[in-house]
């Protein structure tokens, strides 16, 4: 049986189930190489607390259909009265990039995750020529994840002073120019993650090889390399390399951009200073607040909350959007959808999608940005279910009794962008994580 | 006050079955992890069994078969069925709680001592 998702094959990933401390391996294609859980085992639970291990699901029992892969294995649980065995089912959903396995929940005899990646679109559009796994958990079993980094299109500038290079790289997977090609990227080679233009001409100086490293707290490792032959005549006989080294800053503070720390005979060290790098529960909330001891900061959004069946509406000159954050009010138009953003043609009223569901909520206050997003809507051509980002600005004087109002900004691939200044959006900082 | 109270422990033939049990006061029992663990005279505490929040169990392999664990969120109790008992099963068994918002919560103990 051919595997179902041939990009996630290279890896072993990693989920994890922090409310009762257990790390599971899965190898989707084949198995994970634990001597403690088999040489078939394709999900391998590592139970921190009493440091054993089970194989939850056998590679060899694995069955999949276009949007779940499930491993059973020969293990009895114990339900009383039946003869089921231990499994493991994945389900995938498709997303812009390689994702993450998302351990979601238990029960007896079943092991539940859920995987947004772009292995699982109908359509190629978000495919990478060459993508790693862009997360790592820590000791602590805390999550750092590099995924909101990754550039779709476009690349990051490094800042360097050497005025006669840029050195250009994507976060995880290639630079893709043709979605965006921007002058000075459209020389770059396809495959290269990092690409050094010296006048016309560009350079691949590295291809992501491996995935994300932790190399101690609060500070994590890509290393890119070039892959194919042939040296560059200016890098003194020597193959290049690019590592970069994302350090979570310890407190809050604005994004930094790249910065190129050393340079020899190709070999480029770059540092970057961002709350991407921190663990994610510094950064998010399911909720539509963040605060206490872990984040630093105080927000709270729920205010925008609007009751009695009344939403916010946004223009999209095709589209009017109707908004409802930070609760579980039905918007008129979008009955029965759980929508928290709710997409309705003007032409033909008739035609409503929901652009983001309310139980599918994460706030985020990551670089001195806060953004609510919310997905899970209905899907697009793609399989790409529509999702919703809405970034807040701190407004003191914003109407509305200061809760201002949403503006549409855009659209890419079935997410629609929002702005909204409001003085709920006011941080308010504590010091030290 | 958050404490776990052990009980049902005793003197059994080898072959025999005890049903221990521990109950819990000022936790939300259903959020956290259930273990038992046991301490043989002279060794070190070895697990025995865990009972996740979502309902998995797992069991050490010297028990496997032979030793269930189960919990009534009612009743604040998480039990543990032990059946075929063998002179190897002596010790104090002790029942742990644990969460990711609570340090881990032991109680005192139970003897069970398998011994014809």
């Known amino acids: 049986q051919a595997a179902p998702f041939p990009e996630l094959c290279s890896y072993t990933w990693e989920a994890v189930d922090t409310k009762n401390n257990v790390l599971y391996k899965i190898n989707i294609c084949g198995s994970v190489d634990i001597v403690q859980c088999g040489p078939s085992s394709a999900v391998c639970m590592h139970d921190l607390d009493t440091r054993t291990y089970h194989s939850v699901g056998d590679s060899v029992l694995r069955s999949a259909t276009r949007s779940l892969l499930e491993f059973n294995t020969t293990v009895s649980c114990d339900q009383q009265g039946t003869n089921h065995r231990v499994q493991s089912s994945i389900a995938f959903l498709c997303g812009k990039t390689l994702g993450t396995p998302e351990f979601v929940t238990a029960t007896e005899c079943v092991h539940y995750f859920e995987w947004r990646t772009t292995a699982a679109c109908k359509k190629d559009i978000f495919k990478a020529n060459k993508e790693v796994p862009c997360y790592v958990f820590d000791e602590e079993l805390r999550k750092h994840d590099l995924n909101p980094l990754i550039k779709l299109s476009g690349a990051y500038l490094v800042d360097d002073s050497d005025p006669d290079t840029s050195l250009f790289i994507n976060v995880c997977r290639d630079i893709d120019t043709l979605r965006d090609p921007g002058s000075q990227l459209r020389a770059c080679p396809p495959g290269t993650a990092a690409c050094l233009v010296r006048g016309h001409q560009a350079f691949d100086v590295g291809q992501p090889r491996d995935g994300l490293k932790v190399v101690r707290k609060d500070r994590l490792v890509l290393s890119y390399v070039r892959e194919e032959a042939g040296k560059l005549d200016f890098c003194d006989g020597h193959s290049p390399a690019v590592t970069i080294t994302f350090v979570c800053p310890s407190e809050r503070r604005e994004g930094t951009i790249p910065k190129l720390t050393a340079k020899s005979n190709c070999r480029y060290e770059i540092e970057w200073i961002t709350e991407y790098a921190c663990h994610r529960d510094y950064l998010e909330s399911k909720t539509c607040s963040l605060s206490g001891e872990q984040q630093d900061v105080s927000i709270d959004l729920t205010p925008l909350a609007q009751s009695g069946g009344s939403s916010y509406i946004s223009d999209g000159k095709e589209y009017l959007f109707y908004l409802n954050v930070c609760g579980e009010t039905e918007i008129q138009f979008c009955n029965k959808k759980q929508a928290a953003v709710c997409q309705v043609k003007k032409s033909d009223t008739s035609q409503v999608k929901a652009a983001g569901r309310y139980h599918n909520q994460t706030l985020r206050y990551s670089d001195g940005d806060l953004t609510l997003i919310y997905f899970g809507g209905d899907e697009c051509s793609s399989g790409f279910q529509r999702m919703s980002v809405i970034n807040f600005e701190c407004n003191k004087t914003a109407g509305n009794d200061g809760k201002g109002t949403p503006v549409f900004t855009g659209e890419v691939d079935c997410t629609y962008f929002f702005t909204w200044d409001t003085e709920y959006a006011c941080v308010h900082h504590h010091h030290h994580h | 006050d958050v404490q776990l109270v052990e009980s049902g422990g005793g003197l059994v033939q080898p072959g025999g079955s005890l049903r221990l049990s521990c109950a819990a006061s000022?936790?939300?029992?259903?959020?956290?992890?259930m273990d038992w663990y046991r301490q043989a005279p002279g060794k070190q505490r070895e697990w025995v069994a865990t009972?996740?929040?979502?309902?998995?169990?797992t069991y050490a392999d010297s028990v496997k078969g032979r030793f269930t664990i189960s919990r009534d969120n009612a009743k604040n109790t998480v039990y543990l069925q032990m059946n075929s008992l063998r002179p190897e099963d002596t010790a104090v068994y002790y029942c742990?709680?644990?969460?990711?918002?609570?340090?881990?919560?032991w109680g005192q103990g139970t003897l069970v001592t398998v011994s014809s």
């Open positions: 009972l996740a929040s979502y309902g998995w169990k």
């Open positions: 742990k709680a644990s969460s990711p918002v609570l340090n881990d919560i």
């Open positions: 000022g936790i939300i029992f259903s959020d956290n992890r």
